[in-house]
Interface confidence: medium
């Protein structure tokens, strides 16, 4: 039977009819203990005939009286089957059983949905002893019910290792609809369909859903929960929510903003972190992402030379970490630099252009075709070379550095000469006769000294030994890290 307790839960009759120890008598219980641990020992007294049980698990006692009559089966008495009440109301329900006093060590426990209720529940077991039986009433009360209290409650009693189980008492807590799934904020592509989901539950069921867009209802007729709203596409931001209705009233979901994806705003604050002869390290602050994650960024570099035709070098990089080293630039050059970033919709406009300059660098290659002659008549060594390619000087050539090392038995001395930038030959005095002179040349800019050429050796004979054969740079080896010309 379903007993409705809409606004108030009243105690229900514990037994179908009078019996010794029934609450319909004026007996005061001999003992009343709070059900703190989930188990209560039953106090046993001399037996009387219990009232007839209805349903539930039954224990058939094997003990017989003096006349050898079997005792009747034990069972919990039938009680209310279904209690319906509103959230936050109080409820009390119980189960009862009459137990012959011959039984020892009986315990009653409460279970909900298959799990034993232990601890912090308000359960009381009361004992009403008589000559032959003891009526045991186990009460369970909840002062303010919540949805989580919904479920099937039963009593269990153990007697002589037998388990007796009561009929279930179904507690149904009704209230306003409760959302189990609410619409989520989304970022969507313009004019592209998308779905929103709303789900709410009672009891009471059914729960009906209305959709609301920008404060206006979308559907005239409600849909049963769960509901999926298909929006064919938006051209501007909108706020959606859903209303859930049941017999108890209305609950409104959170409002969610649906944003329209757009191209990002341009990056701001592009700044120069470091500059070398061939590279510039820049950083930037990304603009607004247009409701779509940045994918990558493009650094655009153009020569800030009035005579240049404005063509742009493009370097692509990941969107993070908002830092990029632009390499392979020319030394001592001016550049305009802009940054643009993209998301799935497209590229942002370019940031404001900034001006940056590379510094002067040391030359990247040595002078070429170094040749050394001995001019014995004047006791000089003539050195000739070709200047490095202009584009590999990495700055304004200020001259050359010549290293000449003189080695003879037990002697080695190195001398350095500086030559002006217009020279491509030099003359040095013979320092030691009957010795080897090793010559190397490096180009020099304000950015530093470039690499020295491969060594060229010439033997300086003792006086009177004529040898005019020139020495020149050997073919460079394959490990040379620059273009060999």
């Amino acid at each position: 039977a379903i007993t409705e307790a809409r606004e108030e839960a009243k105690p229900y009759p514990l037994f179908p009819g009078p019996f010794p120890g029934s609450l319909q008598t004026d007996h005061t219980p001999l003992l009343s203990l709070p059900h703190a641990s989930g188990y209560q020992p039953a106090l046993m007294f001399s037996p009387t005939q219990p009232g007839r049980p209805h349903t539930g698990n039954v224990a058939i006692p094997q003990v017989t009286s003096v006349e050898s009559k079997p005792l009747p089966p034990l069972a919990f008495k039938h009680t209310v089957g279904h209690i319906i009440l509103s959230e936050h109301k109080g409820v009390k329900f119980n189960c009862s059983i009459s137990v012959p006093n011959i039984y020892q060590d009986t315990t009653i426990s409460w279970w909900k949905d298959g799990k034993e209720l232990l601890g912090a529940h308000h359960a009381i077991t009361q004992f009403y002893p008589d000559d032959e039986v003891t009526a045991i009433i186990a009460s369970f009360s909840i002062t303010s019910v919540q949805r989580s209290d919904n479920g099937s409650y039963i009593c269990k009693m153990k007697i002589n290792n037998e388990e007796i189980v009561s009929d279930p008492i179904y507690i149904e807590v009704q209230g306003l609809p409760h959302f189990t799934k609410q619409p989520e904020s989304m970022n969507v592509t313009r004019n592209t369909a998308f779905n929103l989901t709303c789900q709410a539950v009672g009891p009471p069921e059914p729960v009906n859903i209305f959709w609301v867009q920008n404060s206006s209802r979308v559907n005239e007729q409600p849909e049963k929960s769960p509901s999926v709203l298909t929006v064919p596409g938006l051209t501007e931001m909108a706020v959606f929510s859903c209303e859930a209705h049941n017999d108890k009233g209305l609950t409104v979901s959170k409002g969610v903003q649906i944003n329209i994806k757009a191209i990002p705003s341009p990056p701001t604050e592009v700044s120069i972190r470091n500059s070398t002869a061939h590279s510039i390290l820049i950083s930037w602050v990304p603009g607004f992402d247009g409701y779509s994650p940045f994918r990558n960024c493009s650094i655009q570099v153009k020569e800030a030379d009035p005579l240049s035709n404005g063509s742009v070098m493009i370097f692509n990089t990941s969107a993070l970490p908002h830092l990029y080293q632009i390499k392979q630039l020319q030394a001592l050059a001016n550049y305009s630099i802009g940054v643009s970033c993209m998301n799935e919709i497209g590229w942002s406009a370019v940031s404001p252009w900034i001006l940056a300059s590379t510094t002067e660098g040391a030359p990247s290659v040595a002078p070429l075709n170094v040749t050394v002659f001995l001019n014995e008549s004047s006791d000089n060594v003539d050195i000739r070379w070709m200047k490095p390619p202009t584009k590999q000087q990495d700055g304004e050539l200020v001259g050359y550095r010549i290293s000449h090392v003189w080695q003879s038995a037990g002697i080695s001395k190195e001398l350095l000469e500086e030559v002006g930038q217009n020279g491509s030959r030099a003359r040095i005095s013979v320092q030691v006769h009957n010795a080897t002179c090793t010559v190397r040349i490096a180009a020099v800019t304000r950015g530093g000294v470039g690499p020295f050429s491969d060594p060229v050796k010439i033997f300086i004979p003792a006086h009177g030994w004529v040898d005019y054969a020139p020495s020149s740079t050997p073919a460079p080896g394959n490990a040379d890290p620059v273009l060999i010309i």
């Epitope: 005579l307 584009k391 394959n478 010309i485």
Partner: antibody, heavy 120, light 108 residues
Framework: QVQLVQSGAEVKKPGASVKVSCKAS????????INWVRQAPGQGLEWMGW????????KYNEKFKGRVTMTTDTSTSTAYMELRSLRSDDTAVYYC?????????????WGQGTTVTVSS | EIVLTQSPDFQSVTPKEKVTITCSAS???????FHWYQQKPDQSPKLLIK???NLASGVPSRFSGSGSGTDYTLTINSLEAEDAATYYC?????????FGQGTKLEIK
């Protein structure tokens, strides 16, 4: 976008000279080398040399030294390659290419090619 | 002069197959100086891969390159009909700049 547009086909007699032009656009002409590469019918690619338009610095393949001259006109962003004393084995398609300037030397853009036929 | 030798000279392949072209150099070359080009019939060559393994702009990801020292490889995964062309390797290590003799790829 970067473009290299070459002059039209030429037919020459042995011993004559030919001058092929290559007009560059879409980038700073003086920043990159212009290289010349040729391809004889049914054959592979052969590098002839480069010129650096900013200062006219040239580097030629020894095979063509004395017969080839590369020049540029920066005012019109045009490069020229002249090959003298033509022989029948100079019959080829001549390409101008942009040499990437980072000394790792590759050719990132190519002209459409100019067919030079040497025949008596 | 650095001589580049490609293998094979010619290859006939069915679509979706994997193709490998090798290029052997007569001297050791740093991988930064090694590049590949594609030339379709009656067209100019086109830069395909620079610095051994970096795809040039617009080149499909089915192309890849690898190698070091003297041995370099161009690989085409899952060949497509449009890949019918002659492929050349090139070194930028020393003058004269040189190319391999080419590998002609025919689609069956």
């Amino acid at each position: 976008q970067v473009q290299l547009v070459q002059s039209g086909a030429e037919v020459k007699k042995p011993g004559a000279s030919v001058k092929v032009s290559c007009k560059a656009s879409g980038y700073t002409f003086t920043t990159y080398d212009i290289n010349w590469v040729r391809q004889a019918p049914g054959q592979g690619l052969e590098w002839m040399g480069w010129i650096y338009p900013r200062d006219g610095y040239t580097k030629y393949n020894e095979k063509f030294k004395g017969r080839v001259t590369m020049t540029t006109d920066t005012s019109t962003s045009t490069a020229y390659m002249e090959l003298r004393s033509l022989r029948s084995d100079d019959t080829a398609v001549y390409y101008c290419t942009r040499g990437y300037y980072d000394n790792l030397y590759y050719f990132d853009y190519w002209g459409q090619g100019t067919t030079v036929t040497v025949s008596s | 002069e650095i001589v580049l030798t490609q293998s094979p000279d010619f290859q006939s392949v069915t679509p979706k197959e994997k193709v490998t072209i090798t290029c052997s150099a007569s001297s050791i070359i740093s991988s930064n100086y090694f590049h590949w080009y594609q030339q379709k019939p009656d067209q100019s060559p086109k830069l395909l891969i620079k610095r051994t393994s970096n795809l040039a702009s617009g080149v499909p990801s089915r192309f890849s390159g690898s190698g070091s020292g003297t041995d370099y490889t161009l690989t085409i995964n899952s060949l497509e009909a449009e890949d019918a062309a002659t492929y050349y390797c090139q070194q930028g290590r020393s003058v004269p700049l040189t190319f391999g003799q080419g590998t002609k790829l025919e689609i069956k």
